[in-house]
Amino acid sequence: LPSPEGATSCECEEGFFRAPQDPASMPCTRPPSAPHYLTAVGMGAKVELRWTPPQDSGGREDIVYSVTCEQCWPESGECGPCEASVRYSEPPHGLTRTSVTVSDLEPHMNYTFTVEARNGVSGLVTSRSFRTASVSINQTEPPKVRLEGRSTTSLSVSWSIPPPQQSRVWKYEVTYRKKGDSNSYNVRRTEGFSVTLDDLAPDTTYLVQVQALTQEGQGAGSKVHEFQTLSPEGSGNLAV
């Protein structure tokens, strides 16, 4: 027989839930569907992930997103998590915004990003609502740097990158400083593959790094090299 009064709370149908913190008067809700649309746009050693909210919110407004990352080595095809080696623009779990930038990606590595949508009742089911996007990083190789010549007051430095990548580079940035002086440094920009650093101190070690500048931003930087000018007694013209 029907009760003379309505029930104070109703059991949820299968697939619908109330979170422990939900009041009994709240309607039953369910986990959201996956993020509707996910894009991964590579920019050098960065990827911008953007997505749109799930089409089905599950009847709740407390949707948050989590981003996870997997990297795969092209030579072997082996894959593994990459949380430890990448940097997110904000903590990748509990995101409320629908975009995040991932940086410090490695050249020539394949990455798969998973964006999961969750709400207050997602923890009550075992299934997950996620979408994935893959991207290959084609950041320029770090320049290979050589010391071509030196004098008491100058260092002649050259560098190379693989020919297929040269067309992507519009300039090279050469940063140098005296060894032991981390407070000041000098920067030279050039379109060529060599530079002579002048007005240096004799018999002094300089730290030199070359970085390619591309349309997408900075390419990978070279190693930091240590090059030493000649001492006055051992001087001759640009000799290595």
Partner: antibody, heavy 130, light 108 residues
């Protein structure tokens, strides 16, 4: 082929001074920056510092965490370098190694600070206990 | 001061590939060296300058380095590869040498 042989006292009391010496056989002594490294039992490697003697100039560089207590000196006539660590405590108990870098420090203007170590001494276990 | 982070342990079955990572801020701009150390012995250099092998080291040891992570790869792992592995760099900002905390490789 360069060889390193090290020696020194293995048992010390707290507040005493640790003293170890490393002899270099073969190779050009003045071309390299010679290092001391230690490893407490069951723990990782810790760089102590390095020394170079070229011409009449001694160059020293020490781990900041030990700098106030450590001295690395050179005897170029014997191709030897030595480690002294003052005011030792139980925390200084470790195996101490001397080590040679892979390459001369500078060659034709190209220098290698913090180079890889291709040759190590046999290690000396130093215990500090009262 | 510059910090190098290694996983405390890595386990791998014989014949498989082991990867040991060494993380550090912009480590790709530094030369990374790797050592193998077996119990009671001094460390042995297995890879220098990111990926070069000293003479006598088998080609199953290889290395790579870019971004914030350097990796030592040991292919076709054997029981004899069970050891502690350490990475090392020079921090040019402070002019000091730094070791990673070490990774114990266990062959299952």
């Amino acid at each position: 082929q360069v060889q390193l042989q090290q020696w020194g006292a293995g048992l010390l009391k707290p507040s005493e001074t640790l003293s170890l010496t490393c002899a270099v056989y073969g190779g050009s002594f003045s071309d390299y920056y010679w290092s001391w490294i230690r490893q407490p039992p069951g723990k990782g490697l810790e760089w102590i510092g390095e020394v170079n003697h070229s011409g009449s100039i001694n160059y020293n560089n020490y781990n900041p965490s030990l700098k106030s207590r450590v001295t690395i000196s050179v005897d170029p006539s014997k191709n030897q370098f030595s480690l002294k660590l003052t005011s030792v405590t139980a925390a200084d108990t470790a195996v101490y190694y001397c080590a040679k870098p892979l390459r001369p420090h500078c060659t034709n203007g190209v220098c290698y600070s913090g180079d890889a170590f291709d040759i190590w001494g046999q290690g000396t276990m130093v215990t500090v206990a009262s | 001061s510059y910090v190098l982070t290694q996983p405390p342990s890595v386990s791998v079955a014989p014949g498989q590939t082991a990867r040991i990572t060494c993380g550090g801020n912009n480590i790709g701009s530094k030369n990374v060296h790797w050592y193998q150390q077996k119990p009671g012995q001094a460390p042995v250099l297995v890879v220098y300058d990111d990926s070069d092998r000293p003479s006598g080291i088998p080609e199953q040891f290889s290395g790579s380095n870019s971004g914030n992570t350097a990796t030592l790869t040991i292919s076709r792992v054997e029981a004899g590869d069970e050891a502690d592995y350490y990475c090392q760099v020079w921090d040019s900002s402070s002019d000091h040498l730094v070791f990673g905390g070490g990774t114990k490789l266990t062959v299952l």
